[in-house]
Amino acid sequence: QRFAQAQQQLPLESLGWDVAELQLNHTGPQQDPRLYWQGGPALGRSFLHGPELDKGQLRIHRDGIYMVHIQVTLAICSSTTASRHHPTTLAVGICSPASRSISLLRLSFHQGCTIASQRLTPLARGDTLCTNLTGTLLPSRNTDETFFGVQWVRP
Amino acid sequence: QRFAQAQQQLPLESLGWDVAELQLNHTGPQQDPRLYWQGGPALGRSFLHGPELDKGQLRIHRDGIYMVHIQVTLAICSSTTASRHHPTTLAVGICSPASRSISLLRLSFHQGCTIASQRLTPLARGDTLCTNLTGTLLPSRNTDETFFGVQWVRP
Amino acid sequence: QRFAQAQQQLPLESLGWDVAELQLNHTGPQQDPRLYWQGGPALGRSFLHGPELDKGQLRIHRDGIYMVHIQVTLAICSSTTASRHHPTTLAVGICSPASRSISLLRLSFHQGCTIASQRLTPLARGDTLCTNLTGTLLPSRNTDETFFGVQWVRP
């Protein structure tokens, strides 16, 4: 009976359902444009199932094609605010290992106060994703306004 | 050999492929900021496989992590209209049960006429998702401009 | 009993993990608003696993519900450029077979220089998706700024 049951099932972990949804922890010091993320049920609705955080940056643990998504909202912002400040741009990329460094996703805020996008991309075990916010305005830490996540889609 | 093969297999129904894509039905009466949704093949390309509609709001039937996505376009809108009627904001959240009430996703239109975003979030059986549009502008009912959906991703 | 059990099971490879992520190749001649896409590991991080390209347009090979996503960034653009050249609109739709022609996703740029969205939609084997960019501004070919993809989600 136990044997028959086992036949119907596939170990969940072997499906490669790696997934993470992160909330903003803090921004970096002056010369560091990276956003630093945090996740875990104690923090609210953020979580990591497979990927890990390494000093606030997301590290991939399983090879595959991933859906990467992000939303960032500027904290002090109106349609005029965005145009009166230095251009604000968000880029998501692989920042380590250095040999695989590449920008995956890039958006500018222009007249808007929120950017949101998503894309499919191959990622490998050990890839660390960084989210660089260049500009002079601070992002909102509200968990429904700024978040970043990945979802394993297929090998 | 048969055993090894069987181990690679998974019952289709246990995959938990709950998914829904909805189109706008109507907005609420004056004091009700909620958007009311509809879905089903008779209506076009909208559908519900698992989740259900409860008085125009989406109710979840299976626990898990979901990808929630939305696009809303304002109906009679230009960048000047949008900024003149600012702030128009869209929020997606769990509105019932009350004990689980929380905002999951929030965006303002600022100078734009369309917002679109997505996020991963844990949802539980019985959670009802509401989409609140605050402001004086009306959303477009065109099915390629305004839509709302969820996709079960993993347990 | 064993036979009944087997009927409930599905080989992992038949899960229908069709997926594609494309980068912009070129725009069409003057009267053709379509964007022409390309994909493959030799080009960078774009790929096709299942779907195929037919003269730069994406053709579906497996019936199912798909997550369709797109980001398009205008090449030489500021908020003033975007509003001066308004309206620039992007529409993603089924363009063949003609009997199934429909717009799935539509966004205008207004004051912004990037649009990004996603939606769930049923697609059938043989459906060809076209992405029409109407307006006088050209899209960026940077692979982190303009991309288009689909992901099979369920039967």
Partner: antibody, heavy 118, light 107 residues
Framework: QVQLQESGPGLVQPSETLSLTCTVS????????WSWIRQPPGKGLEWIGN???????IYNPSLKSRVTISVDTSKDQFSLKLTSVSAADTAVYYC????????????WGQGTLVAVSL | DIQMTQSPSTLSASVGDRVTITCRAS??????LAWYQQKPGKAPKVLIY???NLESGVPSRFSGSGSGTEFTLTISSLQPDDFATYYC?????????FGQGTKLEIK
């Protein structure tokens, strides 16, 4: 309406540390950048440095070795410490708000005069 | 550091006059320049941001122009309330700097 109020001693001994606090009222200290700017009597304006609610700081290179700016979000306050002061540090010190880390300054305190003297 | 040089240092004018103050940057600062007005014993008040944008609540007789290294503040018709000291400020680099000031006095 946001209001900023500087507080601290009006007289500091040479070689001692100048300490000032700015209290923000009528708005949150979160998300903005908070600067100190000084103006010696009869002279022009000199930017000292700024801080945000997370404690990230940027300092004027010419003063960097002597300056520390800190923030206490729970009290809606930020502070300035300037070590090893001399008569050249005598000035009206203003606490100021800006929306961005590189920005025009939209709200100013009324300023407090600090004299460095024996 | 980027040096900001204002001219003239002092300007005498009468009510109703059109006056122009110039600010030069030691290197290009694009349009990242602000103008302030300061009255004796008071804190400065921002008039113009991003070279030519009028701050909310500032009278329309004030205007700014320029980009790169050369900027001007113009008061189209001087009012009695406008006699004060004016400062330019660059915020193109992380160490923002001010001009030395232009004192506008009654002729």
């Amino acid at each position: 309406q946001v209001q900023l109020q500087e507080s601290g001693p009006g007289l500091v001994q040479p070689s001692e540390t100048l300490s000032l606090t700015c209290t923000v009222s009528g708005g949150s200290i979160s998300y903005y950048y908070w600067s100190w700017i000084r103006q010696p009597p009869g002279k022009g304006l000199e930017w000292i440095g700024n801080i945000n609610y997370m404690g990230n700081t940027i300092y004027n290179p010419s003063l960097k070795s002597r300056v520390t700016i800190s923030v206490d979000t729970s009290k809606d306050q930020f502070s300035l410490k300037l070590t090893s002061v001399s008569a050249a540090d005598t000035a009206v010190y203003y606490c100021v708000r800006a929306e961005g880390s590189l920005d025009a300054f939209d709200f100013w305190g009324q300023g407090t005069l600090v004299a460095v003297s024996l | 550091d980027i040096q900001m040089t204002q001219s003239p240092s002092t300007l005498s004018a009468s009510v109703g006059d059109r006056v122009t103050i110039t600010c030069r940057a030691s290197q290009s600062i694009s349009s990242w320049l602000a103008w302030y007005q300061q009255k004796p014993g008071k804190a400065p008040k921002v008039l113009i941001y991003k070279a030519s944008n009028l701050e909310s609540g500032v009278p329309s007789r004030f205007s700014g122009s320029g980009s790169g290294t050369e900027f001007t503040l113009t008061i189209s018709s001087l009012q009695p309330d406008d006699f004060a000291t004016y400062y330019c400020q660059q915020y193109n680099s992380y160490s923002c700097t001010f001009g030395q000031g232009t004192k506008l006095e009654i002729k």
